[in-house]
């Protein structure tokens, strides 16, 4: 049987400074049980961009409705993009546990920031 896949369809996204960036991510299964988190960069120094359960992420909103049942769309929108936001963003599925453990990552989406149109 097919194991869960994390699909980030966009290899790259280019956004003008000051605009919002939508980073797409879908999964193919509701199992294993566990959360999705977004990171910028890879490895131990990666930066947490969004975790639905805890933390404060004022510039990040989820694209799917919060009341959508059996949701498999974990896309996010990041507002007011600046050049400092450039980088590769990863959608990561975790397996529930104590603590949660990383199960599978998407291939990543590279965000580039264009100068603000004058």
């Amino acid at each position: 049987e097919e194991e869960l896949q994390v699909i980030q369809p966009d290899k790259s996204v280019s956004v003008a400074a000051g605009e919002s960036a939508i980073l797409h991510c879908t999964v193919t299964s509701l199992i294993p049980v566990g959360p999705i988190q977004w990171f910028r960069g890879a490895g131990p120094a990666r930066e947490l961009i969004y975790n639905q359960k805890e933390g404060h992420f004022p510039r990040v909103t989820t694209v799917s409705e919060s009341t959508k049942r059996e949701n498999m769309d974990f896309s996010i929108s990041i507002s007011n993009i600046t050049p400092a936001d450039a980088g590769t963003y990863y959608c990561v599925k975790f397996r529930k546990g104590s603590p949660d453990t990383e199960f599978k990552s998407g291939a990543g989406t590279e965000l580039s920031v264009r100068a603000k149109p004058s």
């Epitope: 199992i31 049980v33 919060s66 529930k96």
Partner: antibody
Framework: DVQLVESGGGVVRPGESLRLSCAAS????????VSWVRQAPGEGLEWVST??????YYADSVKGRFTISRDNSKNTLYLQMNSLRAEDTAVYYC???????????????WGLGTLVTVSS | EIVLTQSPATLSVSPGERVTFSCRAS??????IAWYQQKPGQAPRLLIY???SRDTGIPDRFSGSGSGTDFTLTISSLQSEDFGVYYC??????????FGGGTKVEIK
């Protein structure tokens, strides 16, 4: 229509074993977590166990004695119950897990239950 | 483990009355609360999820509210088929999933 049908309940003596089954239909069984929830006579609901893919979760009261498993080719959920105790006497319900938004899980469909009685 | 306390344990109500059930969590569960109805000899039935969203096919006389630690299920006008036991469940932090002790609604 989603259907969950439990079987395998019965009367056993303390220390004995029993295996419950739950036949599922009407949904894509292999992509959902599924659970067992029990209800002792005249009491409230108590969560027993949940299985995702190969990830399993248990209530402390059954850990080490009960094993949850699934066969996606047969759309069937199982609960192997060993070292049964009088306090395991209950109706055992099979339930389909549901999620909402980025969080979960609650139980949107339930079977009718199967009664397990542990008595000497 | 998150403990859910439901009150009152029993409600005696006449058809047509407004009924309110309370569910209090021992810690913040955000909006990760579901409500179930169980009639004698039957399996539980999902009414409300995410504290305030009605499940498919649930009449609009049922409504849920609250967030954090205090939650309410309201039946705006009780019908004869609404008698039974009502349970809340938290799914914010598990295992274990926990249920409240239930509120029994009986005919006055």
């Amino acid at each position: 229509d989603v259907q969950l049908v439990e079987s395998g309940g019965g009367v056993v003596r303390p220390g004995e074993s029993l295996r419950l089954s739950c036949a599922a239909s009407g949904f894509s069984f292999s992509i959902y977590a599924v659970s067992w929830v029990r209800q002792a006579p005249g009491e409230g609901l108590e969560w027993v166990s949940t299985i995702g893919a190969d990830d399993t979760y248990y209530a402390d009261s059954v850990k080490g004695r009960f094993t949850i498993s699934r066969d996606n080719s047969k759309n069937t959920l199982y609960l192997q119950m060993n070292s049964l105790r009088a306090e395991d006497t209950a109706v055992y319900y099979c339930a389909k897990d549901s999620t909402v938004g980025w969080s979960g899980d609650f139980f949107d469909y339930w079977g009718l239950g199967t009664l397990v009685t542990v008595s000497s | 483990e998150i403990v859910l306390t439901q009150s009152p344990a029993t409600l005696s109500v006449s058809p047509g009355e407004r009924v309110t059930f309370s569910c209090r969590a021992s810690q913040n569960v955000r909006s990760d609360i579901a409500w179930y109805q169980q009639k004698p000899g039957q399996a539980p039935r999902l009414l409300i999820y995410a504290a305030s969203s009605r499940d498919t096919g649930i009449p609009d006389r049922f409504s849920g509210s609250g967030s954090g630690t205090d939650f309410t299920l309201t039946i705006s006008s009780l019908q004869s088929e609404d008698f039974g036991v009502y349970y809340c469940q938290q799914y914010y932090d598990w295992p274990p999933f926990t249920f409240g002790g239930g509120t029994k609604v009986e005919i006055k």
